[in-house]
């Protein structure tokens, strides 16, 4: 028969014939023969192939660098490499993940839209009339204005999108 | 043609140092395991040492051969090696080549190793 | 160091008996054994590796089986040209890699 040209799914052509490729979590060791289905052995502690493969080698699990900030989110298995997330407080600077910086506080004037994840920065938002941000936070959202009225009390001191309004007593009226 | 070649026995005195190789043709040299084997005279089949497959290959070998064998490849040259050193009588045995670690699916003719004084 | 304990060491057997060869190892090899059969003046050829896969060629009443530690080689009905020395590898694979022979059985003609 001619030797073929094309291999199926999961098969590999060397040599004029298809052998198996390695499946995930194996390497290759040897190449099929006219005797022997390929030669494949799981990868070892600490390392990696998610696919099915051809390699000799297999890759080694991502270290998540507790320097960088870093943690295990996810442990790797023989078929999947470890995910990094970052420390409390920390996001990372990229989709790989392999470095972490500290989460955005949103200004005065600011307020938190969205909470930084281990993966997301912190989104701040301006304070909109009638809300106010007094402080720098990570987790503060804009407050609303005291409703002076609600308390029978007037406003004394108009609201920023920084500060709260004032409100003070009403005027007695005179006899 | 899928081959193997073993060359370089020879007839040696106590304490000698000797180079085998082992000529590879027929199939893909880097993506293959390859292993060394021998058998002393009327004995039985005795596994030397083991590389894998890739430019880096890993090395291993029989305890009583560690620090007196290394196994080694020539990718360009398609060739396997076996230097021995300080070689004893009881190294004197026809050394195999052999493709593969687990299972040994090809094998060379060997070639004789003797070890006298 | 690993070591395969073959049994036995020679067997005598006629054409047509139902042979069959142990392979122990010294520690758990999962199934990462192969079985050769060598005659007189030849490389040893490859039988079953895998503990049970039959190599391509080899005719069927070969079979092996087991895992872990214990294995076995059977010959269904002895022919002629299956007199010879048989022999079982075991390996170990993890952090590091050895590899070792069982001792050989001699088959001989009864």
């Known amino acids: 028969p001619e030797p073929p040209t094309a291999c199926r799914e999961k098969q590999y052509l060397i040599n004029s014939q298809c052998c198996s490729l390695c499946q995930p979590g194996q390497k290759l060791v040897s190449d099929c023969t006219e005797f022997t289905e390929t030669e494949c052995l799981p990868c070892g502690e600490s390392e990696f192939l998610d696919t099915w493969n051809r390699e000799t080698h297999c890759h080694q699990h991502k270290y998540c660098d507790p320097n960088l900030g870093l943690r295990v989110q996810q442990k790797g298995t023989s078929e999947t490499d470890t995910i990094c997330t970052c420390e409390e407080g920390w996001h990372c600077t990229s989709e790989a993940c392999e470095s972490c910086v500290l989460h955005r506080s949103c200004s005065p004037g600011f307020g938190v839209k969205q909470i930084a994840t281990g993966v997301s920065d912190t989104i701040c938002e301006p304070c909109p009339v009638g809300f106010f941000s007094n402080v720098s936070s990570a987790f503060e959202k804009c407050h609303p204005w005291t409703s002076c009225e609600t308390k029978d009390l007037v406003v004394q001191q108009a609201g920023t999108n920084k500060t709260d309004v004032v409100c003070g007593p009403q005027d007695r009226l005179r006899a | 043609e899928v081959q193997l070649e073993e060359s370089g026995g020879d007839l040696v005195q106590p304490g000698a140092s000797l180079r085998l190789s082992c000529a590879v043709s027929?199939?893909?040299?880097?993506?293959?395991?390859m292993s060394w084997v021998r058998q002393a005279p009327g004995k039985g089949l005795e596994w030397v040492s083991s590389i894998y497959a890739g430019s880096s290959g890993s090395t291993y070998y029989a305890s009583w051969a560690k620090g007196r064998f290394t196994i080694s490849k020539d990718a360009s040259k398609t060739t396997l090696y076996l230097q021995m050193n300080s070689l004893r009588a009881e190294d004197t045995a026809t050394y195999f080549c052999?493709?593969?670690?687990?299972?040994?699916?090809?094998w060379g003719q060997g070639t004789l190793v003797t070890v006298s004084s | 160091d690993i070591v395969m304990t073959q049994s036995p060491s020679s067997l005598s057997a006629s054409v047509g008996d139902r042979v069959t060869i142990t392979c122990q190892a010294s520690?758990?090899?999962?199934?990462?054994l192969a079985w050769y059969q060598q005659k007189p003046g030849q490389a040893p050829k490859l039988l079953i590796y895998d503990a049970s896969t039959l190599a391509s060629g080899v005719p069927s009443r070969f079979s092996g089986s087991g895992s872990g530690t214990d294995f076995t080689l059977t010959i269904s009905s002895l022919q002629p040209e299956d007199f010879a020395t048989y022999y079982c590898q075991g390996t170990v694979y993890g952090s590091s890699t050895i590899s070792a022979f069982g001792q050989g059985t001699k088959v001989v003609i009864k």
């Open positions: 052999a493709r593969g670690v687990t299972r040994l699916p090809l």
């Open positions: 027929g199939f893909d040299f880097s993506s293959n395991a």
């Open positions: 520690q758990s090899i999962s199934s990462y």
